[in-house]
């Protein structure tokens, strides 16, 4: 997908909202494990996946879906400030682990003050744009591979 | 010019649907995180629902399930369609890019019960 393929997508989310994310995969991966990770320093951690967990928390805020002909569903809830941050769709496929998909969360605050706001026109605190850090020589999605 | 243009808000009853759209020109459309909020004379403005430039989606659980995000970036268009409106929906509803951060003028919505 090349280099701006690479880039994650920019999702903004305000506090206590849900978002939706789908990752599409290479229908030979049909019957691999896909997982939900948050990207950290340390590597991805995987938050859920498509693994049947029986042990799974009852107050769990991530659901994943896989909905067939290739097409995978991400759902998180109740999203809070600290859930901010960099997240992946991955697939332990033929071709070893891939990042089908990453998203950059931002969290918007519960209320923004007012003055903030310059109705039809530029605001001045305009956000950071945060896939503005990515590198742009990092490699394809197709080069990935989970750390 | 960079500007975002709403449009579709209007008066409809207890039930009814409506499909707001946001024209946007002077900003790359395609790359922008989208979102459309609301604001009511007696609470903050909030936001509804958001779009991500790929089209992940984010939606407040007030209008979950009845609200649907979407766009149409070889039209430069965000869009809001909004089912099963209820009185508490009646608000002024902007649509805001979030890079450059820019908002539209806003659209009544009122539902009469």
């Known amino acids: 997908q090349g280099i701006v393929g690479s880039l994650p997508e920019v999702l903004q989310a305000p506090v206590g909202s849900s978002i939706l994310v789908q990752c599409h995969y290479r229908l030979q991966d049909v019957k691999a494990q896909k997982v939900w990770c948050r990207f950290l320093p340390e590597g991805c951690q995987p938050l859920v996946s498509s693994a049947v967990d029986r042990r799974a928390p009852a107050g769990r805020r991530t659901f994943l879906t896989d909905l067939g002909g290739g097409l995978l569903q991400v759902e998180m809830v109740t999203l809070q400030e600290e859930d901010a941050g960099e997240y992946g769709c991955m697939v332990d496929g033929a071709r070893g682990p891939q990042i089908l998909h990453r998203v950059s969360l931002n969290i918007l605050p519960p209320e923004e003050e007012e003055e903030t706001h310059k109705i039809g026109s530029l605001a001045e605190n305009a956000f950071s744009d945060p896939a503005g850090s990515a590198n742009p020589l990092e490699p394809s999605q197709d080069e990935k591979s989970i750390p | 010019q960079v500007q975002l243009v709403e449009s579709g808000g209007g008066l409809v009853q207890t039930g009814g649907s409506l499909r707001l759209s946001c024209a946007a020109s002077?900003?790359?459309?395609?790359?922008?995180?989208m979102g459309w909020y609301r604001q009511t004379p007696r609470k903050s403005r909030e936001a509804v629902a958001t779009?991500?430039?790929?089209?992940?989606?984010s939606y407040i659980d007030a209008v979950k399930g009845r609200f649907t995000i979407s766009r149409d970036n070889a039209k430069n268009t965000l869009y809001l369609q909004m089912n099963s409106l209820e009185p508490e929906d009646t608000a002024v509803y902007y649509c805001?890019?979030?890079?450059?951060?820019?908002w539209g003028q806003g659209t009544q919505v009122t539902v009469s019960s």
């Open positions: 002077g900003i790359s459309f395609s790359d922008a995180a």
């Open positions: 805001r890019s979030f890079q450059p951060d820019l």
């Open positions: 779009i991500g430039n790929r089209g992940s989606v």
